[in-house]
Amino acid sequence: MGARRLRVRSQRSRDSSVPTQCNQTECFDPLVRNCVSCELFHTPDTGHTSSLEPGTALQPQEGS
């Protein structure tokens, strides 16, 4: 199911329903209640890219 994209002017007039699925390069931003471009992390030691897991100590990549 795609992300809901309600064309409403004010965020506070939209409902705050459960996050919907976003495409692979996006994630759900609760602040704007929509899918946004999302960057991946890499571990400083290995350089491996990963989705951020709770409790890990990863740093974001420089820039975008």
Epitope: R5, R7, V8, R9, S10, Q11, R12, S16, P19, Q21, C22, C27, F28, D29, P30, L31, V32, R33, N34, V36, S37, C38, E39, L40, F41, S51, L52, E53, P54, P60, G63, S64
Partner: antibody, heavy 125, light 107 residues
């Protein structure tokens, strides 16, 4: 290199209008939310408004709602803040900022990672 | 709107001191809290996001913790360049709101 450059600030009389611009380079504004944050002289940071250019969503602080309008032109990679009915209490340095998101199990973990240099708006008679 | 209450509003410390700043949200914001450093006449800089993740290029002496309503920024060993004002901000629910700031001054 990511960069945000504000312009359009200046001295305006109470009740007047100004339009601030935030020109972005090094990234595409349609992929992020763009925020305006202000700081009155000697005071703390106050969030003003955000726009999500990809879909046109916006939100405003109660203190500016109905007077300020945030917008974005993705073809120019620029965000704007139209300020009408300006008051003395709107006097501040206005910053634009990009919200970056990192993927935390499909949900954004983020913050405002790049900020402009700020533009001073002075409302005085 | 969610209120973010920072304490203390100012503190005096010496180089090498461990400094702790706290931020309390008026309602649950999960871990959607960022911390910023600002020096006079300059734009804020992102230090910590998602409550505990160090932004790229930020020295490891900075750390963040907390979830729900109570959050902490810690500077393990204060350096001369750390004297500045620090702000917390929640981004769980719009409007995003900042704390009132904590000014870290030289003792």
């Amino acid at each position: 290199e990511v960069q945000l450059v504000e312009s359009g600030g200046g001295l305006v009389q109470p009740g007047g209008s100004l339009r601030l611009s935030c020109a972005a380079s090094g990234f595409t504004i349609s992929s992020s939310s763009i925020h305006w944050v202000r700081q009155a002289p000697g005071k703390g940071l106050e969030w003003v408004a955000w726009v999500l250019p990809s879909v046109g969503f916006t939100d405003y602080a109660d203190s500016v709602k109905g007077r300020f309008t945030i917008s974005a032109d993705t073809s120019k990679n620029t965000a704007y803040l139209q300020m009408n009915s300006l008051r003395a209490e709107d006097t501040a340095v206005y910053y634009c900022a990009r919200r970056v998101c990192y993927n935390r199990l499909g949900v954004c973990a983020g913050g405002m990672d790049y900020w402009g240099q700020g533009t001073l708006v002075t409302v005085s008679s | 709107d969610i209120q973010m209450t920072q304490s203390p509003s100012s503190l005096s410390a010496s180089v090498g001191d461990r400094v702790t700043i706290t931020c309390r949200a008026s309602q649950d914001v999960a871990t959607a809290v960022a911390w910023y450093q600002q020096k006079p006449g300059k734009a804020p800089k992102l230090l910590i996001f998602a409550a505990s993740f160090l932004y790229s290029g930020v020295p490891s002496r900075f750390s963040g913790s907390g979830s729900g309503t109570d959050f902490t920024l810690t500077i393990s060993s204060l350096q001369p360049e750390d004297f500045a004002t620090y702000y917390c901000q929640q981004s769980q629910i719009s409007p995003p709101t900042f704390g009132q700031g904590t000014k870290v001054e030289i003792k």
